[in-house]
């Protein structure tokens, strides 16, 4: 199936041009999207392309600029948030950060009503997470690990919390590892529907080992960076939540919220909050075995001043086959009762659907089902639930809209958005207004991405918000690859993969191979989505077919393929990556002396072991980033697939699942080793040992550090390694430069 | 000191409204929930219900739903209990009690009482 | 609702003897956090005094020779010495669930 078909034709040929790696490391082709800044039903906010804030009405069609491009620029502004009340409005600037979600920053409140900038008892600075109260304009900020309350913007703040400490005690945000893999957030604080109360959680990393790595900076010594990062098996974070009522914080003060007794006999997440109503409220804990997952809805007594959970409101979610949840647990979407809600996990046949629940989850109803995923609830209204999944046309990487009526019986099901721009767009998401009134529908592909707006009673398209007419103009005289998504079926296992090929790609030829890989549990590379990037380049510039694979351990096509790595990662995704080379190569048109294999981060984990399967398959391969032994990674994530590195445990597969272990399999493959020194996620320690193991087993490799660079390897940093990738390539291709 | 006091007994014959008041003092009256309970003679306790002056929640106890409307004045830091319909089984005294703060469902300061007769 | 059973009905001791009086709930009035049971005494004429908060705790002004104990569905009231001012009636209130439930009470008279 071609998705992006070629738009060659001979009469044009002398005007097209290949992509060049100038082209993508400039980001000439890079598209925009628009989602609207919701504050009600039927208006949204906009930063214009000139820097103004600018409120649109959708039902009167009328625009005003509610804050100049001046203002913002007397501040250096660079993000903003208006009060629920719209009478003030902070802005951001010296945004500083920190991990994937965290970042300090400077806020000035700027008064609407006067148009200045309010004054006594300003901010304090760097503030590390600031929001407004969903109702009128209280403000709660996390400075120095504790948390802060003010009734109004100009008033004196209220201190909620007094033992934040620097890598110690966190308030209202997330340590580093709850930040990056359970919350996937930088805050750790949730207001109640009408501000009435705010939640927080208190994260205590005492007796948390740290990871200590040198930044270089430009000083006679160098820094040493210390985060609290529990690897496999090591000392967790003591989590506690905590509400305080907003209206009277000093009555009785925080109240902390117990947790379900079967949660609280062993080590235990908690995984999310949501708000259900002012005075109650839904939590969600997990074992740090993570297997079983506690969702208890709490309520406010007000004779107790305090939360109460019974028991008969605590809904347990087991997996038998694998771990709780996808990546993670899924959230619960309240109905209009505020005691029923929806929920997507796993059904009776392993394929995750959304269900409802209104006593208990034995008792749950069953609301979409199929050998497909729903994969996001976007929003429930009194008579419709908007939720996306993968079922159209039974392709796992695509992802459509679609309404449920849940006011009328039986339900009704309606695909919004499958037919709106069928050859375009096939890849989804959504952002609902106010009672979804209103909804823009965002579309990444396979075309050219595209934003528009509708109506949420009828699904009528009001007008298109973005539609990248400038990156359609810049593309029209150049020569992309095609793509292809298509399927292998081996042995009951669907394979399915997207192959980009050169744009005057002819199947009677033989051209190189370059697998790129992912491959992490719970992740999806084969989707339906546009992009111009580094193997675009490859495919059209330097004639390689690239190919991206989804083997097992990969999302959205039920728990077979999912829990196929539970307990033993490093085995089937890399055996799948390797079946599909071979399916590849019995194509015909791939010169099997030239096929190499390349990821990032559990890509270059995967990448790394395939070359080192003793295949034979590979001429080399680059590794970016890898983890090299589960060991050295977050508890939280790897526990998650791997349970713990003890004897009685899963030790064995952890010391066999080393890149270390095959280190003598790397002799006969050319092998591009790549990491940041200053990688707070994947430490450089693993690269380090790689590296170590291999110069031990007297085995030769290539490899590039980036001083002072984190996993995302950003700046300069990209442009060197993506032009150092394709040197390795192309020598190991034998292509000329 | 905190202080609850109440209105003086009644007496009431069956089908008619009593309402009972309950002065506090001694506290910030719009901080503690204000509970009602019951003794009919030679009786046990019988919780009626409660009401916040602060928030103006209030909870009634299922058996009296629709009989009873507790209300507060909190100008005059006043909170009355209302009981219509009477018949002869509501003849006990009442008593108002303050909620103590951080004691989560006790009563730690009651008023005096006041007897309601229902007699014909 | 929370049925409130207290035993004995009726306990006859002489001043300086310990008393100890039961009181048992038809379902568990504890959480994690606190159990809630109050005990009250209660003389006649008179309005109902809080002796002791949430199981165990001492109500400011109460002398401590009160002492209260019990999770779950089973607390006791315990006086250590009876004085002769202690003979009264005395009554367990649970806050767990609403409605808000008293125990039928014990009372305590001289021997």
């Known amino acids: 199936i071609v998705l992006r078909p070629s738009r060659v034709h001979n009469s044009e040929e002398n005007t097209m041009r290949a992509l060049t790696l100038k082209d993508i490391l400039n980001g000439t082709f890079s598209y925009k999207t628009f989602f609207p800044n919701w504050i009600s039903g039927q208006e949204y906010l906009h930063q214009s392309a000139d820097n103004n804030i600018v409120l649109y009405n959708i039902e009167t069609g009328q625009s005003y600029t509610i804050l100049s491009n001046r203002t913002m620029k007397s501040v250096n502004a660079s993000n903003y948030g208006l009060s629920p009340d719209r009478q003030f409005v902070y802005l951001e600037s010296d945004y500083s950060k920190l991990w994937r979600y965290s970042y300090t920053a400077t806020y000035y409140i700027y008064d609407l009503s006067n148009g200045e900038f309010v004054r006594g008892n300003e901010l304090p600075r760097p503030i590390q997470y600031l929001c407004w109260s969903p109702v009128g304009s209280k403000l709660a900020y996390v400075y120095q690990n504790n948390i802060y309350l003010k009734q109004r913007p100009g008033d004196p703040p209220f201190q909620i919390t007094f033992n934040g400490r620097e890598n110690k005690i966190f308030n209202g945000i997330p340590d580093w590892v709850y930040e990056e893999e359970m919350l996937a957030t930088k805050y750790a604080l949730w207001w109640s529907p009408n501000g009435k109360f705010l939640a927080y959680a208190e994260f205590n990393d005492t007796d948390i080992p740290v990871i200590a790595y040198s930044y270089y900076g430009d000083e006679q010594y160098p820094r040493t960076i210390n985060i609290p990062y529990p690897k496999a098996g090591a000392k967790n974070p003591v989590v506690r939540i905590f509400i305080i009522d907003t209206t009277y914080p000093a009555y009785v003060g925080p109240q902390e919220v117990p947790v379900p007794a079967m949660i609280a006999s062993s080590d235990y997440y908690f995984s999310w909050l949501t708000w259900v109503t002012d005075e109650r409220v839904c939590l969600q804990w997990l074992k740090r075995v993570q297997n079983v997952s506690v969702l208890s809805i709490c309520d406010f007594r007000e004779d107790w001043q305090t939360w109460d959970c019974p028991k008969t409101q605590e809904h347990i979610e087991e997996s038998r086959t694998g771990w709780a949840g996808g990546f993670f647990v899924s959230t619960p979407v309240f109905s209009y009762d505020a005691i029923s809600y929806y929920k997507i996990f796993s059904d009776k046949d392993g394929y995750k659907h959304i269900h409802y629940i209104k006593d208990t989850v034995e008792n749950a109803i069953q609301i979409t089902s199929g050998k497909w995923e729903a994969i996001n609830i976007f929003r429930v209204t009194q008579d419709s639930l908007f939720y996306s999944s993968n079922e159209f046309e039974e392709y796992p990487g695509r992802r459509n809209i679609y309404r449920i009526s849940i006011g009328s019986y039986p339900p009704s099901k309606k695909c919004v958005t499958c037919h709106l721009r069928k050859e375009r767009c096939q890849y989804y998401t959504a952002s609902f207004s106010d009672y979804a009134k209103y909804y823009a529908l965002v579309c990444y592909g396979p075309g050219i991405p595209i934003s528009t707006l509708h109506d949420g009673r009828t699904d009528q398209e009001i007008k298109i918000l973005e539609e990248n007419k400038e990156l359609e103009n810049a593309l029209k005289n150049i020569q992309l690859p095609k793509e292809e998504i298509k399927k292998l079926e081996v042995d009951e296992i669907t394979l399915w993969y997207k192959m980009i090929l050169p744009p005057q790609f002819d199947r009677s030829k033989k051209y190189p191979l370059l697998i790129q890989v992912y491959g992490g549990p719970c992740s999806q590379s084969v989707r339906s989505v546009f992009a111009v990037n580094w193997i675009s380049y490859l495919a059209s510039k330097e004639g390689m077919v690239i190919a991206l694979v989804d083997g097992r351990g990969t999302a959205f096509q039920g728990d077979k393929l999912l829990y196929a790595v539970y307990r033993k990662l490093g085995v089937y995704e890399v055996e799948d990556q390797i079946t599909a080379v071979r399916k590849f190569i019995e194509m015909g048109f791939i010169d099997e002396k030239r096929i190499a294999i390349w990821g990032w981060s559990y890509g270059g984990y995967v990448s790394s072991l395939a070359l080192a399967s003793g295949t034979g398959l590979f001429k080399c391969g680059i590794a970016v980033a890898p983890v090299s032994s589960w060991e050295y990674y977050a508890s939280v994530y790897t526990e998650r697939f791997m349970g713990l590195p003890t004897k009685d445990d899963n030790l064995e597969h952890y010391k066999n699942s080393t890149v270390m272990a095959r280190a003598e399999y790397f002799r006969n493959v050319d092998y591009l080793l790549i990491h940041g020194t200053a990688d707070d996620n994947v430490h450089f320690q693993n690269s380090a040992q790689i590296a170590k193991a291999l110069v031990n087993a007297q085995v030769d490799f290539q490899a590039m550090w980036y001083s002072d660079q984190n996993h995302g390897l950003s700046g300069l940093s990209t442009n060197h390694l993506y032009t150092h990738m394709t040197h390795f390539l192309k020598q190991c291709f034998s292509l000329s430069d | 000191q905190v202080q609850l006091v109440q209105s003086g007994a009644e007496v009431k014959k069956p089908g008619a409204s009593v309402k009972v008041s309950c002065k506090a003092s001694?506290?910030?009256?719009?901080?503690?929930?204000i509970h009602w309970v019951r003794q009919a003679p030679g009786q046990g306790l019988e919780w009626m219900g409660w009401i916040h002056p602060g928030s103006g929640s209030i909870k009634y106890a299922q058996k009296l739903q629709g009989r009873v409307t507790m209300t507060t004045d909190t100008s005059t830091s006043t909170a009355y209990m209302e009981l219509r319909s009477l018949r002869s089984d509501d003849t006990a005294v009442y008593y108002c009690?303050?909620?103590?703060?951080?004691?989560?469902?006790?009563?730690?300061?009651w008023g005096q009482g006041t007897l309601v007769t229902v007699s014909s | 609702e929370i049925v409130l059973t207290q035993s004995p009905g009726t306990l006859s001791l002489s001043p300086g003897e310990r008393a100890t009086l039961s009181c048992r709930a038809s379902q568990s009035v504890s959480t994690s956090a606190y159990s809630y049971m109050h005990w009250y005494q209660q003389k006649p004429g008179q309005a109902p005094r809080l002796l002791i908060y949430l199981a165990s705790n001492l109500e400011s002004g109460i002398p401590d020779r009160f002492s209260g104990s019990g999770s779950g569905t089973d607390f006791t009231l315990t006086i250590s010495r009876l004085e002769p001012e202690d003979f009264a009636v005395y009554y367990c209130?649970?806050?767990?669930?609403?409605?808000?439930?008293f125990g039928q009470g014990t009372k305590l008279e001289i021997k």
């Open positions: 009690a303050r909620h103590g703060g951080t004691a989560r469902g006790a009563m730690d300061y």
């Open positions: 209130q649970q806050s767990r669930e609403l409605p808000y439930t």
């Open positions: 001694g506290y910030t009256f719009t901080e503690n929930i």
